[in-house]
Interface confidence: low
């Protein structure tokens, strides 16, 4: 039975040209995390494998930094980065947990904050 829950940064905003940290946290389960995938809609950004470490997709390697923890830092944001991001936790024996974050990249300095974590 899958008992775990994922907390995420929720709906967040950031300025064009800035950077943002995407965070997911899996709790309430003793399952072992074997791999975490970060995806932007249907596009793979990065993988953190428990044995092999991090892999950043070549098309994002100049703008994506792994971490902290199992999170992901996006840099040099553009308006095209607006959209849904998913953290996909592959665990044993539970299976797959997925968290969703919506990022809006703004031209102005207006910032919306997520419910769980604050992103200044």
């Amino acid at each position: 039975m899958m008992t775990g829950t994922i907390e995420t940064t929720g709906n967040i905003s950031a300025e064009k040209g800035g950077s943002i940290i995407l965070q997911c946290h899996l709790s309430s389960t003793t399952a072992q995390v074997t791999q975490v995938n970060w995806e932007q809609q249907d596009q793979l950004l990065a993988i953190c494998n428990a044995d092999l470490g991090w892999h950043i997709s070549p098309s994002f390697k100049d703008r994506v930094a792994p971490g902290p923890g199992l999170g992901l830092t996006l840099q040099s944001l553009t308006v095209n980065d607006t959209g849904e991001y998913f953290c996909i936790y592959h665990t044993y024996p539970d299976g797959t947990y997925t968290g969703r974050i919506f990022l809006e990249v703004l031209e102005s300095s207006v910032a919306e904050h997520g419910a769980r974590f604050q992103i200044p």
């Epitope: 950031a14 991090w54 930094a65 971490g67 902290p68 999170g71 840099q75 200044p120």
Partner: nanobody
Framework: EVQLVESGGGLVQPGGSLRLSCAAS????????MGWFRQAPGKEREFVAA????????AYADSVKGRFTISADNSKNTAYLQMNSLKPEDTAVYYC??????WGQGTLVTVSS
């Protein structure tokens, strides 16, 4: 090999302040991020705050927003967590972690009168 060493923990009264440090050694990458996490007795480790190493992005848990400030000194390979207005519920072992899954040994923060 990367090593993370936390320091600065201790016993403090409610309302007091502490500054934790996390010194990283053995690192060659210039582009990474650091986070602070904590684990209270009988509870799971939880996210506290994070910072990209250029300082351009930070993130905080709601429970510490406005009280804790994360910062980093790239020249010293050190991340900091300034904790103000401490509460008894902030009592925990505080750990720093990096993107590769390296963890420090933790530093105990006890908030009690």
């Amino acid at each position: 090999e990367v090593q993370l060493v936390e320091s600065g923990g201790g016993l403090v009264q409610p309302g007091g302040s502490l500054r934790l440090s996390c010194a990283a050694s053995g690192r060659t990458e210039a582009n990474y991020a650091m986070g602070w996490f904590r684990q209270a007795p009988g509870k799971e480790r939880e996210f506290v705050a994070a910072i990209s190493w250029d300082g351009g992005a930070t993130a905080y848990a709601d429970s510490v927003k406005g009280r804790f400030t994360i910062s980093a000194d790239n020249s010293k390979n050190t991340a900091y967590l300034q904790m103000n207005s401490l509460k008894p519920e902030d009592t925990a072992v505080y750990y720093c972690g990096d993107y590769e899954g390296h963890w420090g040994q933790g530093t105990l923060v006890t908030v009690s009168s």
